[in-house]
């Protein structure tokens, strides 16, 4: 008689990434009997919640339940009903909520409280909603990409992200760019991590890792743009801001009250003789780059070397995976190829930013104008951050790999977060066991 497959013995987990600009829900799946193996967890679904980030609901917390409904209902459909009660749900909020908490702990707490009450109404095993630290965000992103790349496995893996790197057990560094913060995380080469706040020690699968991480709050792409606008409007002679980071012919009216609605622009706040100003794009990459560099204070460093704003950064080491907005922006600009040099990227950015706005709108008719208008800034910001902020060079640029997904799972902190909270990354290498014989009868 023919062997019959038993119902698959699988487990599921849900993580909601409550970012500054939006919330995404991720569903993960893994074979129950292989929980401690590396690389067995994979993403089966991503659901992007319609609307802004949860911090924007501070004046309308009663709307949070409706906001989360569609994606939570999607999770109900994707995960078999028999598994609902044992499927853990975690929500991690990042820099948008960190900024709200800076303004008021109560306001942030109220938002999370309503989120928790909403998520508790579903049949899953809700494990809590919390604001994760920047250090956690960096660390979990690093764990995610190295887990998916098979870097923690002692076994030879069958896939590789780049052809020349097949069996190298050196971990990848992680570069994460969000809307409100950016993280850099990697294992330095025999370098003392001079600032304790930036040092992490892990023991994973029997190996020790000394990891450097830092999260730059206010240096995500959206908050960096607000910072740049607040800085530049200080020296504008009238209510017109001629901005090199926007395409020629682009125009947009900005409320001064919106400009100062974030703790990130506090240092540039001043009284302006107008309530609104108009951005007028002039599309000049070099000038845009120069303006962005003024956001990075490189004049002060209390360590042997720094990134910017007096933050310690060891010499860069090894390959890096650049994900989240690093990837989305560069993918849009068609600059993610391993073959594109840093000089070529810069050249292409110069051309892109110089293109007239009307031309850009025609070429990318399907893209929302709000997002489309900001790619020149975002691309220039990414280059500025990587080159001047983190000290990548034209030579080391080839060690940056712009990654969206690895083996079908999104690169980002959520998988690492779930692996940690479900205790699926053992400190010691699990004993190798013979292949499971429970699959067929």
């Amino acid at each position: 008689t023919q062997n019959k497959a038993l119902p698959e013995n699988v487990k599921y987990g849900i993580v909601l990434d409550a970012g500054s600009s939006h919330t995404s829900l991720y569903i993960y799946k893994w074979p129950a009997e292989k929980e401690n193996d590396t690389g067995v967890v994979h993403q089966v679904e991503e659901c992007r919640v319609k609307g802004p980030g949860i911090s924007k609901f501070v004046q309308k917390v009663n709307e949070i339940g409706i906001y989360l409904t569609d994606c939570m209902e999607r999770a109900r459909e994707v995960i078999p009903r028999s598994q609902h009660q044992e499927t853990p749900v975690y929500l991690g909020a990042t820099a948008g909520m960190r900024l709200l908490r800076m303004e008021s702990e109560e306001l942030a707490d109220r938002v999370l409280d309503v989120v928790e009450r909403s998520l508790s109404n579903y049949p899953f095993d809700f494990q809590g909603a919390r604001i994760i630290t920047g250090q956690e965000e960096g660390a979990y992103g690093w764990i995610t990409i190295n887990y998916l790349l098979g870097k923690f496995s002692q076994k030879t893996r069958w896939f590789s992200i780049v052809p020349y790197e097949t069996n190298n057990q050196e971990t990848f560094g992680a570069l994460d760019l969000g809307g409100a913060s950016t993280q850099v995380t990697f294992v330095p080469q025999n370098q003392t991590i001079e600032s304790p706040d930036n040092a992490l020690q892990f023991r994973l699968y029997g190996k020790d890792y000394n990891v450097y991480t830092h999260s730059f709050l206010c240096y995500g792409k959206d908050q960096a743009l607000w910072q740049k606008l607040a800085k530049d409007i200080q020296v504008a002679s009238n209510e017109i801001l001629r901005d090199p980071c926007f395409h020629p012919g682009y125009k947009k009216v900005v409320n001064v009250s919106d400009l100062y609605k974030t703790p990130c622009t506090k240092r540039f706040e001043m009284t302006l003789p107008f309530q609104q100003f108009e951005i007028q794009g002039i599309g000049n990459y070099q000038q845009c780059h120069q303006s962005i560099l003024e956001l990075f204070n490189t004049s002060y460093c209390p360590y042997s070397q720094c990134a910017f704003n007096g933050i310690f950064l060891p010499p860069l080491q090894g390959d890096f995976g650049a994900f989240s907005a690093f990837y989305f922006v560069m993918k849009f600009l068609n600059l993610t190829s391993e073959k594109v040099s840093q000089e070529k990227v810069t050249e292409m950015m110069k051309k892109f930013c110089a293109q007239p706005w009307e031309e850009i709108k025609t070429s990318y008719a399907g893209v929302k104008e709000k997002y489309l208008s900001e790619y020149c800034f975002s691309g220039t910001y990414i280059l500025s951050l990587l080159l001047q902020g983190y000290h990548f060079t034209a030579d080391s640029w080839e060690h940056i790999h712009f990654i969206g997904k690895i083996q079908g799972s999104d690169a980002g902190w959520t998988l690492g977060y779930m692996l940690n909270l479900t205790n699926m990354i053992p400190a010691e290498q699990p004993l190798s066991t013979p292949l499971s014989h429970s699959t067929y009868v």
Epitope: Q59, Y260, P263
Partner: antibody
Framework: QVQLVESGGGVVQPGRSLRLSCAAS????????MNWVRQAPGKGLEWVAS????????SYADTVKGRFTISRDNSKNTLYLQMSSLRAEDTAVYYC????????????????WGQGTMVTVSS | DIVLTQSPASLAVSPGQRATITCRAS??????MHWYQQKPGQPPKLLIY???NLASGVPARFSGSGSGTDFTLTINPVEADDTANYYC????????FGQGTKLEIK
């Protein structure tokens, strides 16, 4: 040292308007949420309105919603309360109060208070 | 609105003794409860924030405890200068105050 000085109080007829000001000094004004709290003669304290540090959150007590407007001018280090359609029950000492902090986070409690300005609504 | 009920409405305590004032919230406020002292003709003064943290410059004779719905302000030992009205305030929702407790020193 932190100082909050209210002004603009006085006697006003029902239905009329009044604008209170609170001049702040001794701290970085734009880093703190600010509030108005009132106290009717011989009565307890009643919160009136809040304006968070980055204007993310502006809120009013139900008793004044739609009639009072809180605002701030960070360049002048000044908090305002525009009061319109005044009623007899709005008679009180109006205090300007600063939000406190829990370490690096803002808190919705009041760590410094001004001396108050008296508003009397009477025909 | 969250209603705060203070008890007792007034109390008289001898110097050197302990004074205890309680504040009950109509719904849970986590640890977002704060205490103020107000003397006649003066603005309120912050004593305790977030249930148990002593405000700057406040003597250690003052202490606070509680979480959820039930909170306590304790003054031990009481001194003559402590004659005042005491108010609790929650900040879990838009701020509300208790009705006040009048403390007299015998």
């Amino acid at each position: 040292q932190v100082q909050l000085v209210e002004s603009g109080g006085g006697v006003v007829q029902p239905g009329r308007s009044l604008r209170l000001s609170c001049a702040a000094s001794g701290f970085t004004f734009n880093n703190y949420g600010m509030n108005w709290v009132r106290q009717a003669p011989g009565k307890g304290l009643e919160w009136v309105a809040s304006f968070s540090s980055s204007s993310t959150y502006i809120s009013y007590a139900d008793t004044v919603k739609g009639r009072f407007t809180i605002s701030r001018d960070n360049s002048k280090n000044t908090l305002y309360l525009q009061m319109s359609s005044l009623r007899a029950e709005d008679t009180a000492v109006y205090y300007c109060a600063r939000h406190g902090r829990y370490g690096g986070y803002g808190g919705f409690y009041f760590d410094y208070w001004g001396q108050g300005t008296m508003v009397t609504v009477s025909s | 609105d969250i209603v705060l009920t203070q008890s007792p409405a007034s109390l008289a305590v001898s110097p050197g003794q302990r004074a205890t004032i309680t504040c009950r919230a109509s719904e849970g406020v986590k640890s977002y409860m704060h205490w103020y002292q107000q003397k006649p003709g003066q603005p309120p003064k912050l004593l305790i924030y977030k249930a148990s943290n002593l405000a700057s410059g406040v003597p250690a004779r003052f202490s606070g405890s509680g979480s959820g719905t039930d909170f306590t302000l304790t003054i031990n030992p009481v001194e003559a200068d402590d004659t005042a009205n005491y108010y609790c305030q929650q900040s879990w929702n838009d701020p509300t105050f208790g009705q006040g407790t009048k403390l007299e020193i015998k």
